[in-house]
């Protein structure tokens, strides 16, 4: 194999390389023959917008349709592939942006041919276009910084083509990172191009290089962990939330509290009841019961769902949120309307909190 | 066209085995990652496992983990799920279930297989 | 693992309605989820991937959106058809965990 020397997220020559020059490499979209393909050119500002295909100035045609920043190219075939170019002509410059297309049908059979993502297909390996790795999707890789909570799960991608099909392999701060680098080791899935670490720890900071090569070239990029550890507090929920409902006798609604909390919450629904007639104990605390919380046997504890409400449901329903630093909690009204009103959304008002001891 | 075509299911006592097998069709099924997902009566889904095109990485959730083995035999476009120490709480209808290459959604799915474990 | 939460767990709408489902999941997981339909006694059909792409073959009234935590799935103009339980699923861990579903029936 050739050598390398590792220079951030570049295009690695090798000590022959395979082209004469080669400043970034373009996207690549893949059609199949007789499919459409739709390109949008990826500049900001472009006023006029000028197309070239290997050099050559591109203009419509029967198949070809130029509309602003959009280039179509309806039932394409294989002469339509090759290196094409969107130029924005501004007042005082003009910036190029290279793309290739190649249409062929060696994409993988039973494959979905309306793919627009374009980074799934590849050229078939045993075809004669030998060709150095390239980046087929770019926007997934656009998030270098991860800072990310203690306990979470990381997954850095580096989606890849090139002919032969390039091999993948990832470097922690420059270095082989190996299995036995991290407790419980990290997941490699080759078909994604992803490197997968669960529950990281503070140790797992660093910088994690994915290195594509094949026997034409290598490509690198470099990602950047940071891991936030957490600090405790008391649930937080999302303002606005239980919101205030209003149904008519017999219908349905459901209250939804959003929880944030790194320690395990604990969720409790809670409705102010009646006993005697009276809604106070003699002790002066009001009566409660707990309608739902979370546990084994509770399915999305952050919902209360009522279903075919009567009058007796009507009244202040609470989402009291606990966990081992402390609690928190919010209320929303429900009003039952007699059959004969139409049900309507109140205006959503939060309730003040009531902070239950 | 593809297709997916389980079978294998069928009524088991507990701590016993069964071998689900998943017939491919319509497509190279070496390129592509599979999955088994399985329903329990009047339940939702859950993942249960997934294997590489090239069967260089599996991985299984953690209900089943130690228990069941996913396979695959691309000579015979074949998938296959060994299912061993069986519970009650495995019962289930098991789809095996095509990966779209690098977006990890479910396009293909077979008929699913209904597996009971009862004594 | 990481948990994806659904809500509602189910909803009454009526043809031509606009119907909204929510996905939580309980981290960053990205644009890396897939929504579902799945009618009594079949198979789950893919409608989208990675939170936003419609599947081939499915109608644009289906939509889905989000990133991180929070997603969407929007049916614009609700048609017989559609009343089924829809599922979400995250593919950011190992582990492909599902929502426990929503489901959409006849009001």
């Known amino acids: 194999r050739p050598s390398f020397s590792l220079v951030e997220d570049t295009t690695l020559e090798p000590e022959e390389p395979p082209t004469k020059y080669q400043i970034s490499q373009p996207e690549v979209y893949v059609a199949a023959p007789g499919e459409s393909l739709e390109v949008r050119c990826l500049l900001k500002d472009a006023a006029v917008i000028s197309w070239t295909k290997d050099g050559v100035h591109l203009g419509p045609n029967n198949r070809t349709v130029l509309i602003g920043e959009y280039l179509q190219i309806k039932g394409a075939t294989p002469r339509d592939s090759g290196l094409y170019a969107c130029t924005a002509s501004r007042t005082v410059d003009s910036e190029t942006w290279y793309f290739m297309v190649n249409v062929t049908d060696a994409i993988s059979s039973g494959d979905d041919e309306d793919d627009t993502d374009g980074a799934e297909d590849f050229v078939s390996e045993n075809s004669n276009n030998k060709r150095a790795p390239y980046w087929t999707n770019t926007e997934k890789m656009e998030k270098r910084l991860h800072a990310v909570p203690a306990a979470n799960t990381v997954k850095f991608r580096c989606p890849a083509g090139g002919n032969p099909m390039p091999t993948m392999r990832w470097l922690k701060n420059g270095k082989e990172f190996k299995q036995e680098h991290r407790i419980g080791g990290y997941k490699v899935r080759n078909q994604h191009w992803s490197l997968i670490m669960e529950s990281v720890v503070p140790s797992d900071k660093g910088n994690y290089t994915c290195v594509v090569e094949n026997e034409y070239g290598s490509i690198n990029h470099t990602y950047h962990l940071d891991v936030v550890e957490r600090s405790p507090h008391r649930p937080i929920l999302q303002a606005g939330l239980p919101a205030n409902a209003s149904t008519v006798v017999g219908g349905d609604v459901e209250f939804v509290c959003k929880v944030y909390s790194d320690a395990q919450p604990h969720i409790q629904w809670i409705k102010h009841v009646e006993k005697n007639g009276s809604k106070y104990g003699p002790d002066g605390l009001p009566y409660l019961k707990v309608l739902k919380h979370s546990g084994i046997n509770s399915s999305n504890a952050e919902v209360l769902a009522l279903f075919n409400v009567t009058e007796a449901d009507a009244g202040e329903y609470i989402c009291k949120v606990s966990n081992y630093i402390g609690q928190a909690n919010q209320s929303a009204w429900l009003t039952v309307l007699p059959k004969q009103q139409a049900p309507g959304r109140e205006k959503e008002i939060t309730a003040s909190p009531d902070y239950l001891e | 066209e593809v297709q997916l075509l389980e079978s294998g299911g069928g009524l088991v006592q507990p701590g016993g085995s069964l071998r689900l097998s998943c017939a491919a069709s319509g497509f190279t099924f070496s390129d592509y990652a599979m999955s088994w997902v399985r329903q329990a009566p009047g339940k939702g889904l859950e993942w249960v496992s997934v294997i590489e095109g090239d069967a260089s990485y599996t991985h299984y959730a953690d209900s089943v983990r130690g228990r069941f083995t996913i396979s695959r035999d691309n000579s015979k476009n074949t998938l296959y799920l060994q299912m061993n120490s069986l519970r009650a709480e495995d019962t289930a209808v098991y789809y095996c279930a095509r990966e779209r290459t690098y977006s990890s959604a479910f396009d293909y799915w077979g008929q699913g297989t209904l597996v009971t474990v009862s004594s | 693992d990481i948990q994806m939460t659904q809500s509602p767990s189910s909803l009454s709408a009526s043809v031509g309605d606009r119907v909204t489902i929510t996905c939580r999941a309980s981290?960053?997981?990205?644009?890396?989820l897939n929504w579902y339909q799945q009618k009594p006694g079949k198979a789950p059909k893919l409608l989208i991937y990675?939170?936003?792409n419609l599947q081939s073959g499915v109608p644009s009234r289906f939509s889905g959106s989000g990133s991180g935590t929070d997603f969407t799935l929007t049916i614009s103009s609700l048609q017989p058809e559609d009343f089924a339980t829809y599922y979400c699923q995250q593919h950011y861990s190992p582990s492909h965990t599902f929502g426990q579903g929503t489901k959409v029936e006849i009001k």
């Open positions: 981290q960053d997981i990205s644009s890396d």
């Open positions: 990675d939170a936003s």
